[in-house]
Interface confidence: medium
């Protein structure tokens, strides 16, 4: 049954990433493991998330042994830095090769770091927010995604990726406003159920 | 990892200039914001200068250094560069540079994750 639903999930990740695409899907994913690793760094997030991505496109496109060599080797590498990953993959770590891949994928959200800064200083108080969205815009909507999405292990990842596009819509208005302070400044009010 | 390698350290007299460089290798440079930190023999280490992830108009300077050192970055060339104008001895030490993804500016070595090993520059009177 375990691997009748693990299967049924694997179909599920390569229609999505055939349907919405790897810019979707590695969205999806920043989400997903931010939500899941909340005390790794972005950059930790972002490593995981374009190693994850190559490892869908090959198992979805049939690269079977090329999908089941990186498989392994991002499960090696999540493991041998799991202490800037996450304190729940011991158990998961210490299962053989063909059990660990499975084991990474379910496991548990890890705890919260505590002290975490309010996402508004970052997103939407400083003076930086159009500067740092032009100048990279996926990678400045990833982290506020990442930011987001470790806040709220409760939301779906569905709700995030709709707060993230709402963010981006918000940005590409305001930023072409003549006070773009001004007009993004209430944006986080939008997200308030 | 992200490596972190500091160059450009030096002996040079008091009110002339050095320009340090830190490039970064390993992982992507735009994530991070970079720090310049500092210590003197038989002192903490302090903080000298900030400059934010992507933009990089964002910048933060320890009050003994404003107005004399300015921090910059290249995203393209994965580097960062302290410029050091009217040194003191004072600013003689062992001047260190860091990356964090914590927070897109800091001034608080707690948020660096990834530290090089350091340059000295030594101003002599």
């Known amino acids: 049954d375990e691997g009748k639903a693990s299967s049924a999930k694997q179909r599920l990740k390569c229609a999505s990433l055939q349907k919405f695409g790897e810019r979707a899907f590695k969205a999806w994913a920043v989400a997903r493991l931010s939500q899941r690793f909340p005390k790794a760094e972005f950059a930790e997030v972002s490593k995981l998330v374009t190693d994850l991505t190559k490892v869908h496109t090959e198992c979805c496109h049939g690269d079977l042994l090329e999908c089941a060599d990186d498989r392994a080797d991002l499960a090696k590498y999540i493991c041998e830095n799991q202490d800037s990953i996450s304190s729940k993959l011991k158990e998961c770590c210490e299962k053989p090769l063909l059990e660990k891949s499975h084991c990474i994928a379910e496991v548990e959200n890890d705890e919260m770091p505590a002290d975490l800064p309010s996402l508004a200083a970052d997103f939407v108080e400083s003076k930086d927010v159009c500067k740092n969205y032009a100048e990279a815009k996926d990678v400045f909507l990833g982290m506020f995604l990442y930011e987001y999405a470790r806040r709220h292990p409760d939301y779906s990842v569905v709700l995030l990726l709709r707060l993230a596009k709402t963010y981006e819509t918000t940005l590409e208005k305001c930023c072409a406003a003549a006070d773009p302070h001004e007009c993004y400044a209430k944006v986080f009010d939008e997200f308030k159920p | 990892q992200l490596q972190v390698v500091e160059s450009g350290g030096g002996l040079v007299q008091a009110g002339g200039s050095l320009r340090l460089s830190c490039t970064t290798s390993?992982?992507?440079?735009?994530?991070?914001?970079m720090g310049w930190f500092r210590q003197a023999p038989g002192k903490e280490r302090e903080f000298v200068a900030a400059?934010?992830?992507?933009?990089?108009?964002?910048?933060d300077y320890a009050n003994s250094v404003k107005g004399r050192f300015t921090i910059s970055r290249d995203n393209a060339k994965n580097t960062v560069y302290l410029q050091m104008n009217s040194l003191k001895p004072e600013d003689t030490a062992v001047y260190v540079c860091?990356?964090?993804?914590?927070?897109?500016?800091?001034?608080?070595?707690?948020?660096?994750?990834?530290w090089g090993q350091g340059t000295q520059v030594t101003v002599s009177s």
């Open positions: 400059i934010s992830w992507f933009a990089g108009d964002t910048t």
């Open positions: 860091a990356a964090s993804s914590a927070r897109p500016l800091s001034s608080r070595s707690d948020e660096y994750h990834y």
């Open positions: 390993g992982r992507a440079f735009i994530g991070y914001a």
